[in-house]
Amino acid sequence: QRLPRMQEDSPLGGGSSGEDDPLGEEDLPSEEDSPREEDPPGEEDLPGEEDLPGEEDLPEVKPKSEEEGSLKLEDLPTVEAPGDPQEPQNNAHRDKEGDDQSHWRYGGDPPWPRVSPACAGRFQSPVDIRPQLAAFCPALRPLELLGFQLPPLPELRLRNNGHSVQLTLPPGLEMALGPGREYRALQLHLHWGAAGRPGSEHTVEGHRFPAEIHVVHLSTAFARVDEALGRPGGLAVLAAFLEEGPEENSAYEQLLSRLEEIAEEGSETQVPGLDISALLPSDFSRYFQYEGSLTTPPCAQGVIWTVFNQTVMLSAKQLHTLSDTLWGPGDSRLQLNFRATQPLNGRVIEASFPAGVDSSPRAAEPVQLNSCLAAGD
């Protein structure tokens, strides 16, 4: 297996982006949701994959300079999937006072489809991304972001909503997936694991990353989220993986340094506006895209997911702060807030670049690449 290289010669203050070398493509897991070595079973047996909640989105950002190194998804190491059962998404939360567990949570009852029938849909998120099987679509152009560099005032609301940390974004952050596919950013949020346990929602070749940021957007064709839920393309999420690097990420530090203030679930604080694009990778031209769902109830489908090929680097201390500061409902730590990967059920993940091309020699037999469907339509 090839291991990712650490970021080299990052600019002062540390850039957001990870390295650029491609992920290995060996040892493909045989199932979308088979358990990974990085995700040891939780303290309790978990029901099927639909029961495992997944979070929504985080702040969006616009392209940065190409000076930073970056780790690319197609370069990530792969991990052989052990043969144990479904990968758990259990955050080991325990509700106080013997709660009846009748609200949704990560791991355990109630099964999510009982909370929202859409969670049993066929086209759910997150998914495992296998670059070799992605369809290269030249029509997928670089993402366009406008208005993501926010001034310090007005301040933004940072909230511990009990299942993630959420930054509410002001009006005016515009994003285009392509011509006529225009969106406005609503909020961003994060998903993470626990000490020694990664917590990204999406995986690549079975590899789970330490954390993942989601920036959630609403199509300009709709006035409100509830009008867009379940409508194809009504919502779009930009997702990026967060990895450990040698330097502190100054952009993320503006948020992470305030988590202590919102440790209690339901609490919130105000933070100065910041460059939201600095929270995302710098390369807006290389990404994977597919149609899926919200990763928490109501699990509404029709969501366009764009997963950056480049990762974002945070220091070990920052990743620890993210996973070890917040509390969720019932006096439980807010950790492992990711949903299990869901089956593709025939969906083809598209790539804006030839992700399936492996430049290194390999003895394995060639893989049939999927063809690009209707990218850009």
Epitope: E56, H103, W104, P154, G162, H163, P171, L229, G328, P329
Partner: antibody, heavy 120, light 108 residues
């Protein structure tokens, strides 16, 4: 069309616990915040607190020590408990839908309200 | 917490007239997350305006909200008989959520 219906005892004795339930019909309870608001006779509106369908709560600091909210997604219901009540807690109690976690837009659906009197 | 002050306490007008209600916040309201509600006797409040200026579903266009920061007026361009009621502003940008004391619009 989403509708809300409050239910619970109309009379509660001082020092006891007021318990109300709001039943959501005509739509899903998931992904929304759900609030409780009260209004003493002839007075204005006071927000008590809210709950998300993950069980996360946020209470008005003035009532926090006495309030507990819970949600039962399988029954499409959420509940309010207010302990150690006094005559000052006599009011009409409303439940309301309070936006989504993806987007805030105020309380767009309200129950018709239930009158709770605290008296021995 | 953010304190919302509404004025006037009572507004006496005739049908067909224009009504302007004011709501002032003690500090800037996050993202202009301010709503207006109408309440008639014996009824629950009804959402009129959210985000300071967006009309809720089914609300006639004679109701319009505006303003930003700390000053948020509500205008009813031409009063209809059914518009006589109490109007509350509410901020939902920061916790705790707070309501103004209300303005009663009565028939002159």
């Amino acid at each position: 069309q989403v509708q809300l219906q409050e239910s619970g005892p109309g009379l509660v004795k001082p020092s006891e616990t007021l318990s109300l339930t709001c039943t959501v019909s005509g739509g899903s309870i998931s992904s929304y915040y759900w609030s409780w608001i009260r209004q003493p006779a002839g007075k204005g509106l006071e927000w008590i607190g809210r709950i998300y369908t993950s069980g996360s709560t946020n209470y008005n600091p003035s009532l926090k020590s006495r309030v507990t909210m819970s949600v039962d997604t399988s029954k499409n219901q959420f509940s309010l408990k207010l302990s150690s009540v006094t005559a000052a807690d006599t009011a009409v109690y409303y439940c309301a839908r309070d936006g989504q976690w993806l987007e805030d837009y105020g309380m767009d659906v309200w129950g018709q309200g239930t009158t709770v009197t605290v008296s021995s | 917490e953010i304190v919302l002050t509404q004025s006037p306490g009572t507004l006496s007008l005739s049908p067909g007239e224009r009504a302007t209600l004011s709501c002032w916040a003690s500090q800037s309201v996050f993202s202009n997350y301010l709503a207006w509600y109408q309440q008639k006797p014996g009824q629950a409040p009804r959402l009129l305006i959210y985000g300071a200026s967006s009309r809720a579903t089914g609300i006639p266009d004679r109701f319009s909200g505006s303003g930003s920061g700390t000053d948020f007026p509500l205008t009813i361009s031409r009063l209809e008989p059914e518009d006589f009621a109490v109007y509350y502003c509410q901020q939902y940008g920061s916790s705790p959520l707070t309501f103004g004391g209300g303005t009663k619009v009565e028939i002159k």
